[in-house]
Interface confidence: low
């Protein structure tokens, strides 16, 4: 099943995807699409790169903010809405018909947390979604399992995430 990433409405979502150009600087085309990776290419393409640069974006909200030329093709979706929820496909289009690298990730967009959730709700959420809180472009700062989660609520989690990364609240679940 897809790895899930959670973002609040109005924030920026960060969907990681990368490859290692070898030798450095020899890039391959990449497409991001809404929907699971199909047999060929990407369905409902939201962003596409060629060997040199981003050459197709369906909206100004879609960005590659990482070091694209080093293979960081992580997708940032700015100012997400509930409609952005769903599975996204990152397809690294390596020549040769069996060589594409396909990565399906799931974006879950939630409404802003207005109040502190009840403890029972918090426990339900944390047991359903063991979380890795991502703090930057290069992966998790710490890994937390349901048994080791500190006593913080969703509002605090999102506040902490926003402070740690300006690309928005994104929580990765195993």
């Amino acid at each position: 099943s897809e790895v899930e990433y959670i973002a609040e409405v109005g924030q920026n979502a960060y969907l990681p995807c990368s490859y290692t150009p070898a030798p450095p600087g020899n890039l391959v085309p990449v497409c991001w699409g809404k929907g699971a990776c199909p047999v060929f290419d990407c369905s409902n393409v939201v962003l596409r790169t060629d060997n040199r640069d981003v050459n197709d974006r369906t909206s100004g909200r879609y960005w590659l903010k990482g070091d694209f030329h080093k293979g960081d093709v992580s997708l940032t979706i700015e100012n997400v809405t509930l409609a952005d929820s769903g599975v996204y496909c990152c397809r690294i289009q390596i020549p040769g018909i069996m060589n594409d690298e396909k990565h399906n990730v799931k974006l879950v967009v939630i409404k802003p947390a207005k109040v502190t959730p009840a403890p029972t709700l918090q426990r339900d959420l944390t047991s359903a979604f063991p979380r890795m809180l991502t703090t930057g472009e290069h992966g998790p700062a710490e890994t937390q399992t349901p048994g080791s989660l500190p006593d913080v609520n969703l509002t605090q989690i999102f506040t902490l995430t926003n402070e740690l990364r300006d690309s928005g609240a994104t929580i990765r679940t195993a």
Partner: antibody
Framework: EVQLLEAGGGPVQPGGSLRLSCAAA????????MSWVRQAPGKGLEWVSS????????YHADSVQGRFTISRDNSKSTLYLQMNSLRAEDTAVYYC??????????WGQGTLVTVSS | DIVMTQSPDSLAVSLGERATINCKSS????????????LAWYQQKPGQPPKLLIY???TRESGVPDRFSGSGSGTDFTLTISSLQAEDVAVYYC?????????FGGGTKVEIK
């Protein structure tokens, strides 16, 4: 020497089914992607399906998607093509081909499939 | 899909003369990382399966006579038979194996004038 021997072709009525097989020898079958390519009488070549070395990834042409299924048994060094809901336009010589994953293919002699009522 | 366009459809050449077949792809089949063009040439004689002549656009398959050569890069490719022999009468196909779906040119029939 690479050897690919197709079998299972023959006449079939529209809507019917056939299962083609391709026995491979002369190379380590499990290391290579395999494909099926067909050629209608007097026509050019059309790729049909491909499957990765371990069978984990299978691709099919749009024209056969949902009707044909490629599979393989690495323990028997054999490639298969299950063809269902056959149509007149599926009439062709079907060739088994080695690789296409990262290099060009080597082809068997082919087996003729004739779809006719 | 990458469309492969061959020209001419047929070609009549005198024995011992040069035959040239062109193939154009709708997008580049050059992979800069490997500096290789994912293009092959096949020869098909009546009643026989296609036989690989050239791969990586210019690498001659083992056992193929050196009168056959391939050239080109990116989107434009050429198969040349430097001195046509009687046994070269056949249909020749180009094929890209850069991306799925695999696609072939329509074929060029080579005959003796």
């Amino acid at each position: 020497e690479v050897q690919l021997l197709e079998a299972g072709g023959g006449p079939v009525q529209p809507g019917g089914s056939l299962r083609l097989s391709c026995a491979a020898a002369g190379f380590t079958f499990s290391n290579y992607a395999m494909s099926w390519v067909r050629q209608a009488p007097g026509k050019g070549l059309e790729w049909v399906s491909s499957i990765s070395d371990n069978g984990g990834t299978a691709y099919h042409a749009d024209s056969v998607q949902g009707r044909f299924t490629i599979s393989r048994d690495n323990s028997k060094s054999t490639l298969y093509l299950q063809m269902n809901s056959l149509r007149a336009e599926d009439t062709a010589v079907y060739y088994c081909a080695k690789d296409f994953g990262d290099s060009p293919g080597y082809w068997g002699q082919g087996t003729l499939v004739t779809v006719s009522s | 899909d990458i469309v492969m366009t061959q020209s001419p459809d047929s070609l009549a050449v005198s024995l011992g003369e040069r035959a040239t077949i062109n193939c154009k792809s709708s997008q580049s089949v050059l992979y800069s990382f490997k500096n290789k063009n994912y293009l092959a040439w096949y020869q098909q004689k009546p009643g026989q399966p296609p036989k690989l002549l050239i791969y990586w656009a210019s690498t001659r398959e083992s056992g193929v006579p050196d009168r056959f050569s391939g050239s080109g890069s990116g989107t434009d490719f050429t198969l040349t038979i430097s001195s046509l022999q009687a046994e070269d009468v056949a249909v020749y196909y180009c094929q890209q194996y850069y991306s799925s779906p695999l696609t072939f040119g329509g074929g060029t029939k080579v005959e003796i004038k």
